[in-house]
């Protein structure tokens, strides 16, 4: 089982590992040569610290934490990263018009520290 | 409140053309593709096809190419479901439906349009 | 023949809990999501659970989905007399794009 500790951030409020929405054109994603639509996506994405337990996705995520403690010169702490993602559909250009294609790891749709 | 309100009932006789609508309101419209289902008397639903209102963009499912066309006029928030020859075999309730944020699910649905043809 | 497949109907008691199943393939709910419709005799469908969890707002947290492998499922606990109704499982399928089952008719006894 996952060993997720508590979401109380002892760095204040908002400081710490999170889910954040930007709003994004086709042309700030660098998409706008190959996707028709949606021409501004609502991105998801993981920001933040990760403290000591804070959201550890795991043991080792606990174990970083520690080493990280003792020696923070070797060991970086824990990444905020996404623990699963909401799909997503979009409307591409092809070789003969248009389809659909749908895309399982784009928006993040919760964060962990790991 | 997001609504979406299709057109009322029709009747025509095989062979006859048809053109059907459902009116967005409550959201913006070009931010949010529209897609069509069919629903045949007692049976199950049918993913017609979807339209990008914003570009007019549209895909059809392989099973309605070429039987239907779906366009839209997003300067009265519009979308619309064409047929240039009906069949018999087009008589169903056609629902139009908003698609969620990510263009996976249909979070808004029309209350339909029965589409009745018969000689 | 739907690409997804559901049981017919399935039936159960006031306060029951019933489940209905909704079995796909590789190409399809095996690597994307499952959404839930509710559809009222004589009523448009309602998204009653999408991206094979969520419930929209307004939904009563009596329905419940979940996945697993190349099946989902949806449960119904507390079941109510309102809750008789076709339900609808919907995915993604590489080559059909949006798919739906053909459709699960619920019957509260009693």
């Known amino acids: 089982a996952r060993a997720r500790n508590g979401d109380h951030c002892p760095l204040g409020p908002g400081r710490c590992c999170r889910l954040h929405t930007v709003r994004a054109s086709l042309e700030d994603l660098g998409w706008a040569d190959w996707v028709l639509s949606p021409r501004e996506v609502q991105v998801t994405m993981c920001i933040g610290a990760c403290p000591s337990q804070f959201r550890a996705a795991n043991r080792h995520a606990q174990i970083k934490t520690s080493l990280h403690r003792l020696k923070p010169d070797t060991v970086p702490a824990p990444c905020c990263v996404p623990a699963s993602y909401n799909p997503m559909v979009l409307i591409q250009k092809t070789d003969t018009g248009v389809s659909l294609q749908t895309y399982d790891d784009l928006l993040a749709k919760d964060c962990h520290c790991i | 409140e997001v609504q979406l309100v299709q057109s009322g009932a029709e009747v025509k006789k095989p062979g006859e053309s048809l053109k059907i609508s459902c009116k967005g309101s409550g959201y913006s419209f070009t931010s949010y593709w529209i897609g069509w289902v069919r629903q045949m008397p007692g049976k199950g639903l049918e993913w017609m096809g979807v339209i990008d209102p914003d570009g007019s963009y549209t895909i059809y499912s392989p099973s309605f190419q070429g039987q239907v066309t779906i366009s839209a006029d997003k300067s009265i928030s519009t979308a619309y479901l064409q047929w240039s020859s009906l069949k018999a075999s087009d008589t169903a309730m056609y629902y139009c439906?908003?698609?969620?944020?990510?263009?996976?699910?249909?979070?808004?649905w029309g209350q339909g349009t029965l589409v009745t043809v018969s000689s | 023949q739907s690409v997804l497949t559901q049981p017919p109907s399935v039936s159960g008691a006031p306060g029951q809990r019933v489940t209905i199943s909704c079995s796909g393939s590789s190409s399809n709910i095996g690597v994307l999501y499952v959404n839930w419709y509710q559809q009222l005799p004589g009523t448009a469908p309602k998204l009653l659970i999408y991206?094979?969890?969520n419930r929209p707002s307004g939904v009563p947290d009596r329905f419940s989905g979940s996945k697993s492998g190349t099946s989902a499922s949806l449960a119904i606990t507390g079941l109510q007399a309102e809750d008789e109704a076709d339900y609808y499982c919907q995915s993604w399928d590489s080559s059909s794009n949006y798919v739906f089952g053909g459709g699960t008719k619920l019957t509260v006894l009693g």
């Open positions: 991206s094979n969890d």
């Open positions: 439906a908003r698609y969620g944020r990510y263009g996976t699910y249909f979070d808004y």
